[in-house]
């Protein structure tokens, strides 16, 4: 009978065993150990037993002892087991984005590894387990399906081997592949909210804003605005779940027509688009023209106002007769005329709306000077010590220089608060000068004395 | 670090009994797999072991003489002392000890410097 | 019990090789061990476990064991190599010696 001690050996791979082979009878005629194993025979020994080292273990194996004795040949086994975690541990790339509400695969890759019986394979959501499963194969791949919310962003998944040989060893070896953190996402089926002018005037600037709620992260939301082949530059601003952009637009001639404009949200691997038409027209303000900015009075002036082809003037008011974009009257300037504005408001339609552009021009009549009873009246009677302001308004275009000189000295305060006295009263000659000529008027002051009263 | 002195009589007569001893420092008896084994050398002659006590106190002697040899330790003195018997001229040589650092490969990495007996009546 | 045999002599010139054998019955099975004894001197272990180095052994000292030879290599020999060599294994639970080989350093 030939022994083998230990009958079991669980090692590491690569590891080194030592084996007693032992023979019945004292003295064996042969005692050894067959094995395709590097082996050595060491100390101690004795004359019916020997120790053999066993080294680079790399594989199960099983050397076998035997011994011949008087009453026969015999041999046993010692098994040896190996264990190795695995080479290779890896959890398979995540999606880049994963949208919320829809399942994740999981898949864990392990190579290598023994005794794979002793093998779990478990797959996890930061420290908590999602599946557990025995590693089958050479090559195994573990999977599991989970559902993904919202709290799952940022969440790191990972897969863990367990190589447990607590049994034996009373060790249980784990392997940990690298973390993968998973981005979900949440884009609404609705498209984004776009509000913005519908026409759009050349070399005029308009405000566009785009916004859409039920977005998560927002944060990582981005957003296209695009005019034409005009590419916007938004301000966005961010609320809890939604957001908004706004950005300035600013059109050219070359732009005139029909444009889309286009907002995308971009979420994760979606996208939610919104597209509007945008009328850019070109509407420049309606022209006044006078005869002559500047006329004498009696001067007969012709006001005329031209617009856009398509658009409708009016002048002063007054609707072109027939409606269309011109319009024109003539007048006999007045004096009265100076300073009068004519104004010239065209309509055009674009794109069903009507937009409205006003011009002024103003006329100035050339008249005078003028001094009037009205104005500049010829009898002042004041009592004496009283406080008085003499009134004498010169009229004309251009405005005359006016004095009032009594013996061609002395000045009357015209428009100063004055004491009466006895000096004041006699004969003034006022005198209105303009570059149109000059006019006089007598003014006679009058000053009550108190013995009349 | 390691050392190994051994000591005993330098001239032993016939049939007399050699009581050598193996005093050592640098390392301990009772640490797992350590081993001091004799081995003696005539004038000019080869190498030849004796015998082998190791920190479980297990022992092992040369064949050839067995039934002559007996080896001991003292873990707590550092001490390994050999006894032979019955003493002849031919057993005129240098007595060594030696420390094997793993008894299982046989080896002895640090020895003494010897010491010379001579039988002789 | 196994028996260990070795040439009584070698001889080298200095900076060449120097190999000295052992043989005995299936030794590669088992771990050989070399010596190096100078006169009036201990013996030094200069290989162990057929073919590891002791820390201060220099490089050119290696072993090899496989088959029913051991053998001890001394590359580029200098004349301080000069002296006895032993080879020693086990024949359970004997500890065998053998008899020993002197390297003459020539010149």
């Known amino acids: 009978q030939t022994s083998v001690f230990p009958p079991e050996v669980i090692l590491p791979r690569g590891g080194s065993v030592k084996v007693n082979c032992s023979a019945s009878c004292d003295q064996p005629i042969l005692l050894g150990m067959e094995t395709p194993l590097p082996k050595k025979e060491i100390l101690p020994g004795g004359n019916n037993w020997k120790m053999y080292e066993l080294s680079n273990v790399q594989e199960d194996s099983q050397p076998m002892c035997y011994s011949n004795c008087p009453d026969g040949q015999s041999a046993a086994k010692t098994v040896l087991t190996v264990y190795w975690t695995p080479e290779r541990v890896e959890l398979a790339p995540l999606p880049p984005w994963q949208p919320v509400g829809k399942n994740l695969t999981l898949r864990c890759q392990v190579e290598g590894g023994a005794p794979r019986a002793n093998l779990t394979v478990v797959l996890l959501r930061g420290e908590k387990e999602l599946s557990r499963q025995s590693a089958v194969g050479e090559s195994a791949e573990v999977t599991t399906t989970v559902p993904v919310g919202r709290d799952d962003h940022g969440a790191n998944f990972s897969c863990r081997t367990e190589l447990d040989l607590r049994p034996y060893v009373l060790k249980l070896f784990e392997n940990t592949s690298a973390p993968h953190q998973l981005q979900t996402f949440d884009l609404p089926a609705t498209p984004p909210q776009l509000v913005s002018p519908q026409v759009l005037e050349v070399d005029t600037q308009g405000t566009v804003v785009c916004s859409l709620d039920g977005l998560f992260p927002v944060s990582e939301a981005q957003v296209y605005l695009a005019l034409g082949d005009q590419k916007l530059n938004p301000t966005i601003t961010y609320g809890d779940n939604s957001l908004s952009a706004k950005a300035s637009v600013k059109v050219t001639a070359e732009e005139e027509g029909t444009q889309q404009l286009l907002c995308a949200v971009m979420l994760g691997t979606q996208t939610q688009e919104t597209r509007q038409t945008v009328t850019i027209y070109s509407f420049p303000a309606p022209n006044v023209n006078l005869t002559k900015p500047e006329v004498s009075e009696g001067t007969e002036v012709i006001v005329e106002c031209e617009a856009h082809p398509r658009a409708k003037v009016m002048l002063n008011g007054v609707p072109a007769q027939p409606p269309g974009p011109r319009a024109q009257f003539v007048l006999k300037a007045t004096p009265e005329d100076n300073g009068r504005s004519f104004s010239c408001s065209a309509t055009l339609e674009v794109a069903g709306q009507l937009v409205h552009k006003n011009q002024t021009r103003e006329l100035r009549v050339l008249y005078g000077p003028r001094l009037d009873e009205k104005d500049c009246p010829g009898n002042w009677t004041w009592p004496e010590n009283s406080q008085q302001t003499p009134m004498c308004q010169a009229w004309g275009n251009p405005l005359p220089q006016l004095k009032c000189l009594k013996d061609g000295t002395f000045p009357l305060p015209i428009g100063q608060s004055v004491t009466v006295t006895r000096d004041l009263e006699g004969t003034y000659l006022c005198q209105a000068r303009s570059t149109r000529g000059e006019v006089t008027r007598e003014v006679t002051v009058n000053v009550l004395s108190p013995r009349y009263e | 670090q390691v050392q190994l002195k051994e000591s005993g009589p330098a001239l032993v007569k016939p049939t007399q009994t050699l009581t050598l001893t193996c005093t050592f420092s640098g390392f301990s008896l009772s640490t797992s797999g350590v081993g001091v084994g004799w081995i003696r050398q005539p004038p000019g002659k080869a190498l030849e072991w004796l015998a082998l006590i190791d920190w479980d106190d297990d022992k092992y002697y040369s064949t050839s003489l067995k039934t002559r040899l007996t080896i001991s330790k003292d873990t707590s003195k550092n001490q390994v002392v050999l006894t032979m018997t019955n003493m002849d001229p031919v057993d005129t040589a240098t007595y060594y000890c030696?420390?094997?650092?793993?008894?299982?490969?046989?080896?002895?990495?640090?020895w003494g410097q010897g010491t010379l007996v001579t039988v002789s009546s | 019990d196994i028996e260990l045999t070795q040439p009584p002599s070698v001889s080298v010139a200095p900076g060449q090789t120097a190999r000295i054998s052992c043989s005995g019955d299936a030794l590669g099975d088992k771990y050989a061990s070399w010596y190096q004894q100078k006169p009036g001197q201990a013996p030094v272990l200069v290989i162990y476990?057929?073919?590891d180095r002791p820390s201060g052994i220099p490089e050119r000292f290696s072993g090899s064991n496989s088959g029913n030879t051991a053998t001890l290599t001394i590359s580029g020999t200098q004349a301080e190599d000069e002296a006895d060599y032993y080879c020693q294994s086990y024949d359970s639970p004997q500890v065998v010696f053998g008899g020993g080989t002197k390297l003459t350093v020539l010149g």
């Open positions: 030696a420390r094997y650092p793993v008894t299982q490969r046989s080896y002895m990495d640090v």
């Open positions: 476990d057929d073919s």
